[in-house]
């Protein structure tokens, strides 16, 4: 079987981590699209998506992951703001595509996410708590579940349950530095 | 509509084998991870082993690795559960269950009616 | 494994009145990524299988009666049937999904007082 890559990002708690999906422009664009985490011994998790059709630039939140589908560019954008020690695992961007399988985006991203230390970013837990907000015009949104081919363009989101957002903003162009490393499955 | 009957169940005597199938409809079959659940007599659920949608990975529970094997055949829309080594305790009502297309959940919308598994001498 | 412990075992409602089931997780079972709870609710009837009625801990499926809410995070969390109607009578179990194995409580028995 195919040896999947993996791009290795090492961050520290509070910080936020950045990366970018491409995919086929053309056979992809308005595709949906998500975010999974891949845990040992366990199947794919869906943790957000975008909507469907993905629009273009327009970001989706759930919980601390935003999401951004660059359709002029064949990107699709994850955030994972105010990382935890917990959130460290494998993740990959897939593209829903019902009802034929989620297609996969490659490299995978394995995140290990440490504690900070002492004026670093992270290091103090009450300062990261209230220090990310999603802009306004962020929709917050749930993957809706699909059920059949003959239901599936009328099936509208199962839900659009409360998805908190903490008060201060968040500066969308200063990502901390992270360090790539490749290295395979 | 959308439909999983399962198949196989029966008698069997300690150290034999069984096989169970489960036959899907109503959905794309191939898209979709599928799992069996089993319920013994007057008890609980317990989550038996998962397959995902083309079958190259497959998790099961510790009480029946290394003798169970769940397996499909996407051609013919059917969920397997190869049982061997059978023991008292696994009898049960074999379920399987196919969760959302998304796995966003990691619940079962759908459910078979089961098919009931007696192992005894 | 997660163990999933559910309370009471047994409960007797009379029709009309409040039923609440309570169910205990051995280690959180939300994702604090995405803020979701991976807890569901299900009701069985004798000599059927399970219906999902919860998930995400406080969503309903759709379908099910909205006198049927889930609440909680964390580790503790809790099914109300409102107003208790005599189709409720069922074994409700609670099941988590964050993580392999998936695992059940052992079930909670609702009956009309």
């Known amino acids: 079987a195919t040896k999947l890559t993996e791009e290795k990002y090492e961050l520290k708690e509070g910080q936020t981590l950045d990366v970018k999906c491409d995919y086929t422009l053309e056979k992809f664009a308005s595709s949906q699209k998500a975010w999974q985490i891949i845990r040992d011994g366990e199947m794919p998790k869906t943790l957000a998506c975008t909507e469907r059709p993905s629009k273009n630039s327009h970001p989706v939140q759930v919980g601390r992951i935003i999401l951004e589908d660059y359709h002029d560019h064949g990107l699709l954008r994850v955030r994972m703001v105010n990382l935890q020690v917990e959130d460290s695992g494998l993740y990959q961007c897939v593209i829903y595509q019902p009802p034929k399988e989620p297609h996969m985006l490659f490299d995978r991203i394995r995140l290990v996410v440490t504690k900070g230390f002492s004026g670093t970013p992270g290091s103090n837990e009450n300062s990261t708590q209230n220090v990310y907000k999603i802009p306004p015009t962020t929709t917050k949104a749930l993957c809706p579940l699909y059920t059949s081919p003959r239901t599936v363009t009328q099936a509208p989101p199962k839900s659009t349950a409360d998805v908190s957002t903490p008060d201060s903003e968040i500066n969308l162009t200063n990502v901390t530095d992270i360090i790539r490393v490749p290295v395979f499955n | 509509q959308v439909q999983l009957v399962e198949s196989g169940g029966g008698v069997v005597q300690p150290g034999r084998s069984l096989r169970l199938s489960c036959a899907a409809s109503?959905?794309?079959?191939?898209?979709?991870?599928m799992h069996w659940v089993r319920q013994a007599p007057g008890k609980g659920l317990e989550w038996v082993a998962v397959?995902?949608?083309?079958?190259?990975?497959?998790y099961y529970a510790d009480s029946v690795k290394g003798r169970f094997t769940i397996s499909r055949d996407n051609s013919k829309n059917t969920l397997y559960l190869q049982m061997n080594s059978l023991r008292a305790e696994d009898t049960a009502v074999y379920y399987c269950?196919?969760?959302?297309?998304?796995?966003?959940?990691?619940?079962?919308?759908?459910w078979g009616q089961g098919t009931m598994v007696t192992v005894s001498s | 494994d997660i163990v999933m412990t559910q309370s009471p075992d047994s409960l007797a409602v009379s029709l009309g009145e409040r039923a609440t089931i309570n169910c205990k997780s051995s280690?959180?079972?939300?994702?604090?990524?995405?803020?979701?709870?991976?807890l569901a609710w299900y009701q069985q009837k004798p000599g059927q299988p399970p219906k999902l009625l919860i998930y995400?801990?406080?969503t309903r499926e759709s379908g099910v009666p909205d006198r049927f809410s889930g609440s909680g995070s964390g580790t503790d969390f809790t099914l109300t049937i409102s107003s208790l109607q005599a189709e409720d009578v069922a074994v409700y179990y609670c099941?988590?999904?964050?993580?392999?194995?998936?695992?059940f409580g052992g079930g909670t028995k609702v009956e009309i007082k």
């Open positions: 109503g959905f794309t079959f191939s898209s979709y991870g």
């Open positions: 995400w801990a406080s």
């Open positions: 280690q959180s079972v939300l994702y604090s990524s995405n803020n979701k709870n991976y």
């Open positions: 269950a196919r969760p959302d297309y998304y796995s966003s959940r990691g619940v079962f919308d759908i």
């Open positions: 397959i995902s949608y083309d079958g190259s990975n497959k």
């Open positions: 099941q988590q999904s964050h993580s392999t194995p998936l695992t």
